[in-house]
Interface confidence: low
């Protein structure tokens, strides 16, 4: 049987289930690496308060559609008096990057997983030549996850004080420069994540080859290196290679980009500071409100929920979009689509799409930026669910009582981009981290 | 002492709605994993929706689209709101809290009944 999702195969995944202190290992092709898990256990369940392992999803007992992956295993369990048998469950949705398997909940019997990843997109437009996992768990099971850094196009330039040549990176990926072609990337040889820039020259000084890994608790190293033996001439026989450090900073501040701090050989060593190395829930929140000793911030949104089925309103060209963020109303004319985010065709308002559900609602502050995020839209047709990204800006004479109002400014790939002038974004820090 | 209680459960019309809640006292709310079951006569217990501490939602196939599980902390209740109902919804519901420090706790079901 061939591998469902082959893109997913050559890594052993982790995801954590927090409030039970769980961590599970994941080989969807083939059998993690844990002894105690029995040699083919595709989910191992490691317990860590008790310190034992359990497989809960074997690799043979393996079975999958376009979405769905289920791993059986023969340990019986006790559901309601039922002959039951362990088993995890892992759904997956098309996304732009490969993601993350996230846990969901666990019954008696069956361990639940989400996965929004490229590799379950009926169209391969968001696919990488090269991707690997970018996202890692600490020692206290806390999750630093970089997607929000990936690029689909285009690249970070790093702050370097050569005047001579210019560096480039994406973050886990390869630079993509078929869908953005800058210029200076355009010369960027395929599969480069870290392209050095020189005159009309390009030069690949690096691939992703392994995850993100954790050197301590706020500090994530990515490594990139040339896969190709042929070596450049102006690196006096050393092959290229690139390590980026990324620094959670000790206090809330503004983002800022990566920098060179040596070079040797060839050698790049970059840093970079950006909130999005520290755990995420210092970063986000399921509610439209992110406070307490965690966050070091107070952020309140929820006075931009409409009642009595009123919507904010945003003109998109073609379209309308009916807005009710942070709360469970309805949006009359959204069809009980629980939408947060609904498009409506001007031409034809009997088409309708939900752009973004009010249940799977995300608030991120890192950086500086403050977004909510509504995913879980109605599918595109390249089986990417429409999702809609709201920035917010500090205003305090914004208008409407302080609230503001959205304005649309553009979609790619079925991901709608909006900004909003509030009061109510008007972030107030602490000061302890 | 720990105990939940269900209330919101009647007899309904297909394609109805009703409100299920499940008040929590004894223990920290907040806290805790928060699932609605269901028991059909003569089925077996199944499992309807979750709502994890941390906010994650998750649904049944049979239920997805029409459920909606939320919270309110503040009054330590959790909520299952049911829009278009079929017969097949007939059922005890159940709900039971999860958390890492205590056993399961159950609470003793409210009845729903959908028919014309």
């Known amino acids: 049987q061939a591998a469902p999702f082959p893109e997913l195969c050559s890594y052993t995944w982790e995801a954590v289930d927090t409030k039970n202190n769980v961590l599970y290992k994941i080989n969807i092709c083939g059998s993690v690496d844990i002894v105690q898990c029995g040699p083919s256990s595709a989910v191992c369940m490691h317990l860590l308060k008790t310190r034992t392992y359990h497989s809960v999803g074997d690799s043979v007992l393996r079975s999958a559609t376009r979405s769905l992956l289920e791993f059986n295993t023969t340990v019986s369990c006790d559901q309601q008096g039922t002959n039951h048998r362990v088993q995890s469950s892992i759904a997956f949705l098309c996304g732009k990057t490969l993601g993350t398997p996230e846990f969901v909940t666990a019954t008696e019997c069956v361990h639940y997983f989400e996965w929004r990843t490229t590799a379950a997109c009926k169209k391969d437009i968001f696919k990488a030549n090269k991707e690997v996992p970018c996202y890692v768990f600490d020692e206290e099971l806390r999750k630093h996850d970089l997607n929000p850094l990936i690029k689909l196009s285009g690249a970070y330039l790093v702050d370097d004080s050569d005047p001579d040549t210019s560096l480039f990176i994406n973050v886990c990926r390869d630079i993509d420069t078929l869908r953005d072609p800058g210029s200076q990337l355009r010369a960027c040889p395929p599969g480069t994540a870290a392209c050095l820039v020189r005159g009309h020259q390009a030069f690949d000084v690096g691939q992703p080859r392994d995850g993100l890994k954790v050197v301590r608790k706020d500090r994530l190293v990515l490594s990139y290196v040339r896969e190709e033996a042929g070596k450049l001439d102006f690196c006096d026989g050393h092959s290229p290679a690139v390590t980026i450090t990324f620094v959670c900073p000790s206090e809330r501040r503004e983002g800022t980009i990566p920098k060179l701090t040596a070079k040797s050989n060839c050698r790049y060593e970059i840093e970079w500071i950006t909130e999005y190395a520290c755990h995420r829930d210092y970063l986000e929140s399921k509610t439209c409100s992110l406070s307490g000793e965690q966050q070091d911030v107070s952020i309140d949104l929820t006075p931009l929920a409409q009642s009595g089925g009123s919507s904010y309103i945003s003109d998109g060209k073609e379209y309308l979009f009916y807005l009710n963020v942070c709360g469970e109303t309805e949006i009359q004319f959204c069809n009980k689509k629980q939408a947060a985010v609904c498009q409506v065709k001007k031409s034809d308002t009997s088409q309708v799409k939900a752009a973004g559900r009010y249940h799977n609602q995300t608030l991120r502050y890192s950086d500086g930026d403050l977004t909510l995020i509504y995913f879980g839209g109605d599918e595109c047709s390249s089986g990417f669910q429409r999702m809609s990204v709201i920035n917010f800006e500090c205003n305090k004479t914004a208008g409407n009582d302080g609230k503001g109002t959205p304005v649309f400014t553009g979609e790619v790939d079925c991901t709608y981009f909006f900004t909003w002038d509030t009061e109510y974004a008007c972030v107030h820090h602490h000061h302890h981290h | 002492d720990v105990q939940l209680v269900e209330s919101g459960g009647g007899l309904v019309q297909p394609g109805g709605s009703l409100r299920l809640s499940c008040a929590a006292s004894g223990i920290i709310f907040s806290d805790n994993r928060m699932d609605w079951y269901r028991q059909a006569p003569g089925k077996q217990r199944e499992w309807v929706a979750t709502?994890?501490?941390?906010?994650?939602?998750t649904y049944a196939d049979s239920v997805k689209g029409r459920f909606t599980i939320s919270r309110d902390n503040a009054k330590n209740t959790v909520y299952l709101q049911m829009n278009s109902l079929r017969p097949e919804d007939t059922a005890v519901y159940y709900c039971k809290a999860s958390s890492p420090v205590l056993n399961d706790i159950w609470g003793q079901g409210t009845l729903v009944t959908v028919s014309s």
């Open positions: 709502l994890a501490s941390y906010g994650w939602k």
